[in-house]
């Protein structure tokens, strides 16, 4: 398991049809972790997607950040993550948003707030043991 925070640049960006697969393990004492799709590599970059499972408050939050300000939070149905359990998430980019798939079921559709073409970095952090990030 690799350490977090994990950052991988996406020099070619992502486009509709791009799929990211993130898999790892939620530690037994986890509070929360996140997957961010960022528009730059510098600190404070805009976030086209902030995917934030919160084990401590039993919710999964989706949001975006633009010019330092967070947008309106969206929440997925239930929490398909458990402390001490492995997980696998697919994030599928489409022309109208990001579809988050957990297990084998669509979990939430987060409509684009920032242009998809701006995404340049994937970041995984927080209380998570990351196994791998794959893209195609």
């Amino acid at each position: 398991m690799s350490n977090v925070p994990h950052k991988s640049s996406l020099p070619e960006g992502i486009r509709p049809g791009t799929v990211l697969r993130i898999r790892g393990l939620v530690p037994p004492n986890a509070s929360r972790f996140h997957v961010n799709l960022l528009c730059g590599e510098e600190q404070g970059s805009d976030a086209a997607l902030h995917f934030n499972p919160r084990l401590d408050t039993s919710e999964v939050v989706f949001n975006s950040k633009e010019q330092g300000s967070w947008g309106r939070e969206e929440r997925g149905p239930g929490v398909p993550f458990q402390r001490g359990q492995p997980f696998e998430v697919l994030i599928i980019a489409s022309d109208d948003g990001f579809k988050a798939v957990v297990g084998d079921a669509q979990y939430h559709h987060f409509r684009h707030r920032l242009p998809l073409a701006r995404v340049r970095l994937v970041e995984v952090g927080g209380d998570v043991q990351l196994d791998s990030v794959r893209i195609f």
Partner: nanobody, 119 residues
Framework: EVQLQASGGGFVQPGGSLRLSCAAS????????MGWFRQAPGKEREFVSA?????????YYADSVKGRFTISRDNSKNTVYLQMNSLRAEDTATYYC???????????WGQGTQVTVSS
């Protein structure tokens, strides 16, 4: 170098079936996640299905093909299949297989195989 060879496309009437195959070869071709995508003329590339090895196989489908398409994998042949049943005119597209790579590689892509559904 990774090579992906897709085959099995063709012309079929609505309601018919096709089975696509994609064989991966070369150094680095043993990825734990493979998938199928499609692109119709004048449209964006669209995710169709993926199969991921993670304590057993997990399969994923676009809503538009769920219940009609089935993805599977033969590890001994390093090949992924897409069984397409109950085909519709809107399934007409060029189908591509892909191998998940680390970010920065943006994965590996095969050449397309054309599927045409028409009466």
């Amino acid at each position: 170098e990774v090579q992906l060879q897709a085959s099995g496309g063709g012309f079929v009437q609505p309601g018919g079936s096709l089975r696509l195959s994609c064989a991966a070869s070369g150094a680095g071709s043993r990825s734990d996640v493979m998938g199928w995508f499609r692109q119709a003329p004048g449209k964006e590339r669209e995710f169709v299905s993926a199969i991921s090895g993670f304590w057993g196989w997990t399969t994923y489908y676009a809503d538009s093909v769920k219940g009609r398409f089935t993805i599977s994998r033969d590890n001994s042949k390093n090949t992924v299949y897409l069984q397409m049943n109950s085909l519709r005119a809107e399934d007409t597209a060029t189908y591509y297989c892909a191998l998940g790579g680390a970010p920065g590689q943006t994965g590996y892509w095969g050449q397309g195989t054309q599927v045409t559904v028409s009466s």
